[in-house]
């Protein structure tokens, strides 16, 4: 698997998308896990609803949310209030039984400031950027929430 880099800014939200073949992964729950070292298991952060038909419902674990568009074939992970310790190597997974297929390897990079982007001109805007050998970069920035604003409809 190639690694896709998603760059975000500390304190803001980062949205990670993992496209997949909706027919091949029909009926399968999905998960988001973190690789903490070169060896060892990928540690589960959050997974989609226990009932596959309800996979569209957003599920939270702390500041990380997951939702699955099973028809369109896109798994979306939202990291809210991104912080330096969120940086790392992650995987989008498709679950079947006790096994898990990797849909995408994702490198989450947390920058202190938009000006820290390596190709920054005057301003850094979200959008796809150039490739780093076997990786490609996406920038995903969303504004900070206003006080009292609810980020998403609360779901369990």
């Amino acid at each position: 698997h190639n690694t896709t880099v998603f760059q975000g800014v500390a304190g803001q939200s980062l949205q990670v998308s993992c496209p997949y073949d909706s027919m091949k992964h029909w009926g399968r729950r999905k998960a988001w896990c973190r690789q903490l070292g070169e060896k060892g298991p990928c540690q589960r952060v959050v997974s989609t609803h226990n009932l596959w038909l309800l996979s569209f419902l957003r599920r939270w674990n702390g500041s990380t949310a997951i939702t699955d568009d099973t028809l369109g074939g896109t798994l979306t992970i939202t990291l809210r209030n991104l912080q330096p310790h969120d940086a790392g190597l992650y995987q989008c997974q498709s679950l079947h039984g006790s096994e898990a297929d990797t849909l995408r390897k994702v490198l989450v990079e947390v920058l202190a400031d938009p000006l820290d982007h390596r190709d920054a001109g005057d301003l850094w805007f979200p959008g796809e950027s150039e490739s780093f050998e076997d990786a490609h970069v996406e920038h995903s920035i969303s504004r900070s929430l206003l006080e009292g604003e609810i980020p998403f409809p609360p779901t369990s």
Epitope: P84, G88, E109, R118
Partner: antibody
Framework: EVQLQQSGPVLVKPGASVKMSCKPS????????MNWVKQSHGKSLEWIGS????????SYNQKFRGKATLTVDKSSSTAYMELNSLTSEDSAVYYC?????????????WGQGTLVTVSA | DVQLTQSPSYLTASPGETITINCRAS??????LAWYQEKPGKTNKLLIS???TLQSGIPSRFSGSGSGTDFTLTISSLEPEDFAMYYC?????????FGSGTKLEIK
């Protein structure tokens, strides 16, 4: 065995620039963040910034923005820090320190430090 | 910026004793705190990460505790090689910051 070898001490004049290097060994260079830390004589440690060698993405302490520039050369697996417009306040020991796997959950390995002396 | 207040700044003890060093953050940093040992002529050593996780190769007499704003490094049964400078560091948010240090000297 993981080691971080830093370049030697330098004596520079006020207003000049200096570029120091940090050459790690014993691990895959692009898998771990590299941090730079300042220690003025008899004082505590100050984080300058970090760079992800895989992407070249860097983050700076606001205090050092415009003063320090972090870069990497993946072909030689070497990290660099350049300090510009030097003053006596920049006289210090500068350390490179390796972060964790694609992240910064503590600095597990440190270089021996590069002493920078700014004097006319 | 997150300020880390380390206490005491200076500590004397004898081998075999148990000592504690405190680190207080100006705001909650969850568990994202590390402890380092600094000795002349040696490279700095990471002792504890995530507030309480002992790094491999570090003797079990070193332990860390705490979360939120209050953290403690405990060294039990002090060995002669433990007399050194100790720093706490937060990596919860940018910029990463260090405590002012605690100098542990032999009595």
């Amino acid at each position: 065995e993981v080691q971080l070898q830093q370049s030697g001490p330098v004596l520079v004049k006020p207003g000049a620039s200096v570029k120091m290097s940090c050459k790690p060994s014993g691990y895959t260079f692009t898998d771990y963040y590299m941090n730079w830390v300042k220690q003025s004589h008899g004082k505590s440690l100050e984080w300058i910034g970090s760079i992800n060698p895989y992407t070249g993405g860097s983050s700076y302490n606001q205090k050092f923005r415009g003063k320090a520039t972090l870069t990497v050369d993946k072909s030689s697996s070497t990290a660099y820090m350049e300090l510009n417009s030097l003053t006596s306040e920049d006289s210090a020991v500068y350390y490179c320190a390796r972060g964790s796997y694609y992240s910064n959950l503590g600095f597990a390995y440190w270089g021996q430090g590069t002493l920078v002396t700014v004097s006319a | 910026d997150v300020q880390l207040t380390q206490s005491p700044s200076y500590l004397t003890a004898s081998p075999g004793e148990t000592i504690t060093i405190n680190c207080r953050a100006s705001k909650s940093i969850s568990k994202y705190l590390a402890w380092y040992q600094e000795k002349p002529g040696k490279t700095n050593k990471l002792l504890i990460s995530s507030g309480s996780t002992l790094q491999s190769g570090i003797p079990s007499r070193f332990s860390g505790s705490g979360s939120g704003t209050d953290f403690t490094l405990t060294i039990s049964s002090l060995e002669p090689e433990d007399f050194a400078m100790y720093y706490c560091q937060q990596y919860s948010e940018y910029p990463f910051t260090f405590g002012s240090g605690t100098k542990l000297e032999i009595k």
